[in-house]
Interface confidence: low
Amino acid sequence: EVEKTACPSGKKAPEIDESLIFYKKWELEACVDAALLATQMDRVNAIPFTYEQLDVLKHKLDELYPQGYPESVIQHLGYLFLKMSPEDIRKWNVTSLETLKALLEVNKGHEMSPQVATLIDRFVKGRGQLDKDTLDTLTAFYPGYLCSLSPEELSSVPPSSIWAVRPQDLDTCDPRQLDVLYPKARLAFQNMNGSEYFVKIQSFLGGAPTEDLKALSQQNVSMDLATFMKLRTDAVLPLTVAEVQKLLGPHVEGLKAEERHRPVRDWILRQRQDDLDTLGLGLQG
């Protein structure tokens, strides 16, 4: 091991403060006590350290906590978080939502980095499920977060968390993901009345089975074409012309513009021409 340089007389840091920005890297290494740094991590962010100086501070923490940092330090990492590798983060055990928020704030406005992805993965695994508060937090920082999860990961979302999901959070979800989320949403919103229920469930209908679509067609919901186009083809095919007409209400005219696209194309091919003609849209089966 390389012999450590001694701290020059009078330069031992009694606390983490602005004077340290004038220390050379070797002076920071020699003169800043790691345990002091750990208890005053919250001050590091307020001091304009260079990237090189932050590297030294990280090294000191790594020496103090070779098996990973305690959450009391992690919560105050601030910009030092950007210096962490996914390997560093895998050693952590983050359980406090405040800690998660503090670190996501540091990365705000940027794409989800490998560090952030690892942090979120550690956090969610530690909690055992994606509870509502966590989901609220993650979707606020990363609206596409939910759709980045595998169906297996989504299965850990409890129905109560679905209340935190906004329509835009589901924009990039594929049918396999909606298949997992829809039954949870159905359970979460089951006590709402017809029109309120439809407003809430609408974004999840890409996972709905035929029988639920049939039930909705009896409730004057006036589904828009954008929602209809996201429905599962296998769920739409068994619907009758009358049921689709009731489901779409005044939006039924939009079928003409979508007649070459799935699921409308496949549905049209399954219908009797006489039934299609009752719509008066010139749809050809």
Epitope: E15, D42, R43, Y65, P70, E71, S72, A102
Partner: antibody, heavy 115, light 107 residues
Framework: DVQLQESGPGMVKPSQSLSLTCTVT?????????WHWIRHFPGNKLEWMGY???????NYNPSLKSRISITHDTSKNHFFLKLKSVTTEDTATYYC????????WGQGTTLTVSS | DIVMTQSQKFMSTSVGDRVSITCKAS??????VAWYQQKPGQSPKALIH???NRHTGVPDRFTGSGSGTDFTLTISNVQSEDLADYFC?????????FGGGTKLEIK
């Protein structure tokens, strides 16, 4: 030398709110550290309640989250604990303390919740 | 929450003896543990942190050791003024949690 001193009412009735003050001398609460409230129950159990950091951010024990609020008055170098809807279960000695593995503790103030 | 267990509620020792007080964490807390001494009628006093560093002014007869889930506070050459409650704290995760305490009695 850093010193912390708790002050409060000594007795509170059930369902009322409890307010405690921690006066810090010898160190500015805006200079660093987390500033904690911890309580010690009669049966010898210690419970961490939460903290306010030098910058004003807070973190609370989830078991108390709906009832607890920690604030500070930086001009007076004080920080405060407010606990709503107290019950006899909140009878304890309340300590304020500095730092993550707290290095300085106040003398404690005993609170009895009784009608 | 992480549970910190001090299985010995009371320990009896004599002046000059060496005594070890143990603390077990319900999960791996690495080295994020501190030890405190509380004498009758006084507030807790920080002894050891991380988990083998003595706080300023703490006599060197107090030593801490351990990592992961098992931690020990050792007092060598016990003095009569060491009569007190001793408890551990983990700060690896929030909420911070304490052990139930071990009361050291001097024969």
């Amino acid at each position: 030398d850093v010193q912390l001193q708790e002050s409060g009412p000594g007795m509170v009735k059930p369902s009322q709110s409890l307010s405690l003050t921690c006066t810090v001398t010898g160190y500015s609460i805006t200079s660093g550290y987390d500033w904690h409230w911890i309580r010690h129950f009669p049966g010898n159990k210690l419970e961490w309640m939460g903290y306010i950091s030098y910058s004003g951010s807070t973190n609370y024990n989830p078991s108390l989250k709906s009832r607890i609020s920690i604030t500070h008055d930086t001009s007076k170098n004080h920080f405060f604990l407010k606990l709503k809807s107290v019950t006899t279960e909140d009878t304890a000695t309340y300590y304020c303390a500095r730092g993550t593995g707290p290095d300085y503790w106040g003398q404690g103030t005993t609170l009895t919740v009784s009608s | 929450d992480i549970v910190m267990t001090q299985s010995q509620k009371f320990m009896s020792t004599s002046v000059g003896d060496r005594v070890s007080i143990t603390c077990k964490a319900s999960q791996n807390v690495r080295t994020a543990v501190a030890w405190y001494q509380q004498k009758p009628g006084q507030s807790p006093k920080a002894l050891i942190h991380l988990p083998s560093n003595r706080h300023t002014g703490v006599p060197d007869r107090f030593t801490g050791s351990g990592s992961g889930t098992d931690f020990t506070l050792t007092i060598s050459n016990v003095q009569s003024e060491d009569l007190a409650d001793y408890f551990c704290l983990q700060h690896w995760n929030y909420p911070l949690t304490f052990g139930g305490g071990t009361k050291l009695e001097i024969k």
